[in-house]
């Protein structure tokens, strides 16, 4: 059975949008008007994972690209990257753990916790045009809350 997916965009709690910054990086910045067309459209796939009553496992691919957000250790630190995959095999219901994020909904906001590295979250900086990264703190300086906008 094909994995169930939806197309969406994400904005952080400061309303910054996510755009490509080079071939394998995302950055967060405020966009308006026609510039909103720059924001990346995600293909969010509902996959197998350590699902709970509060957490839904998803994979976040870039629409029409064979790129997925993944979490790996770099220099002993959990790191967010965009990883290239074989489009013939992805998305799939049984994604490798590094591709899986636990989508957590709290007060109409979303958090994306790495399945590979519990308590590490997709994060953005307060500053403009900084890379999207994997952060190990919630409720601090960095932003871990997002809103999702459906795209048809």
């Amino acid at each position: 059975a094909p994995v169930r997916s939806l197309h969406c965009t994400l904005r952080d709690a400061q309303l910054k949008s996510l755009v490509m910054s080079g071939p394998y990086e995302l950055k967060a910045l405020h966009l308006q008007g026609q510039d909103l067309e720059q924001q990346v459209v995600f293909s969010m796939s509902f996959v197998q994972g350590e699902e709970s009553n509060d957490k839904i496992p998803v994979a976040l691919g870039l629409k029409a690209k064979n790129l997925y957000l993944s979490c790996v250790l770099k220099d002993d630190k959990p790191t967010l990257q965009l990883e290239s995959v074989d489009p013939k095999n992805y998305p799939k219901k049984k994604m490798e753990k590094r591709f899986v994020f636990n989508k957590i909904e709290i007060n109409n906001k979303l958090e994306f916790e790495s399945a590979q590295f519990p308590n590490w979250y997709i994060s953005t900086s307060q500053a403009e045009s900084m890379p999207v990264f994997l952060g190990g703190t919630r409720g601090g300086q960095d932003i871990t809350d997002f809103t999702m906008q459906f795209v048809s």
Epitope: A1, Q48, K55, K93, M95, V100
Partner: antibody
Framework: EVQLQESGPGLVKPSETLSLTCTVS????????VSWIRQPPGKGLEWIGL???????YYNSPLKSRLTISKDNSKSQVSLKLSSVTAADTAVYYC????????????????WGQGTLVTVSS | DIQMTQSPSSLSASVGDRVTITCQTS??????LNWYQQKPGKAPKLLIS???TLRPGVPSRFSGSGSGTDFTFTISSLQPEDFATYYC?????????FGQGTKLEIK
């Protein structure tokens, strides 16, 4: 060798809380999930819920409001608490280990305890 | 939740017979289907996972097939120790759901 052993009182009064413990060996509770399943006398199997290695839980809807699953990794024990029990909760209760193989077989249950009969009666 | 329809609910057969049990799911689950054997007073034992993968130590007379929504469990030549109740389980998504069971009795 993987082993699971359920324990707890065999008799619980209606409206009270059923409390069971599953003690495991041969694997670490921080690495594998554990499910609870029950079987009323002469009937089929019903999956109750599970606790993952992370400590996150998933409770099956019919029991969600009455159910708590927790664990103590250091003691290799998983506990089940079911509140406000009635005669309909009379069953053999099993705990079982999740296969937990990512991208292959995450949700199957490969090893089971021998089960413990809990009777709800005054 | 995924609904499971297992049939027959009971079955009488003789030693040496070939026996087939089917399981249907309410939605496509690929190959995420398991078969368990349960003897009276004992815990279920996993025989087959991923629709057709025989678990270590399980005799080769047991087999499973199918994908999507239709699955089959077969015992090629019944042995006296095979008389038991058999359950299918979908492991595609939570909550996990079992079939109603098939009681295999001696004819």
């Amino acid at each position: 060798e993987v082993q699971l052993q359920e324990s707890g009182p065999g008799l619980v009064k209606p409206s009270e809380t059923l409390s069971l413990t599953c003690t495991v060996s041969g694997f670490s509770l921080s690495d594998y999930g554990v499910s609870w399943i029950r079987q009323p006398p002469g009937k089929g199997l019903e999956w109750i819920g599970l606790i993952w290695g992370s400590g996150d839980t998933y409770y099956n809807s019919p029991l969600k409001s009455r159910l708590t699953i927790s664990k103590d990794n250091s003691k290799s024990q998983v506990s089940l608490k079911l509140s406000s029990v009635t005669a309909a909760d009379t069953a053999v209760y099993y705990c079982a280990k999740q296969t937990n193989i990512w991208a292959y077989d995450l949700y199957s249950m490969d090893y089971w305890g021998q089960g413990t009969l809990v009777t709800v009666s005054s | 939740d995924i609904q499971m329809t297992q049939s027959p609910s009971s079955l009488s057969a003789s030693v040496g017979d070939r026996v087939t049990i089917t399981c249907q799911t309410s939605t496509d689950i690929d190959d995420d289907l398991n078969w368990y054997q349960q003897k009276p007073g004992k815990a279920p034992k996993l025989l087959i996972s991923l629709a057709s993968t025989l678990r270590p130590g399980v005799p080769s007379r047991f087999s499973g097939s199918g994908s999507g929504t239709d699955f089959t469990f077969t015992i090629s030549s019944l042995q006296p120790e095979d008389f038991a109740t058999y359950y299918c389980l979908q492991s595609d998504r939570l909550p996990l759901t079992f079939g109603q069971g098939t009681k295999l009795e001696i004819k």
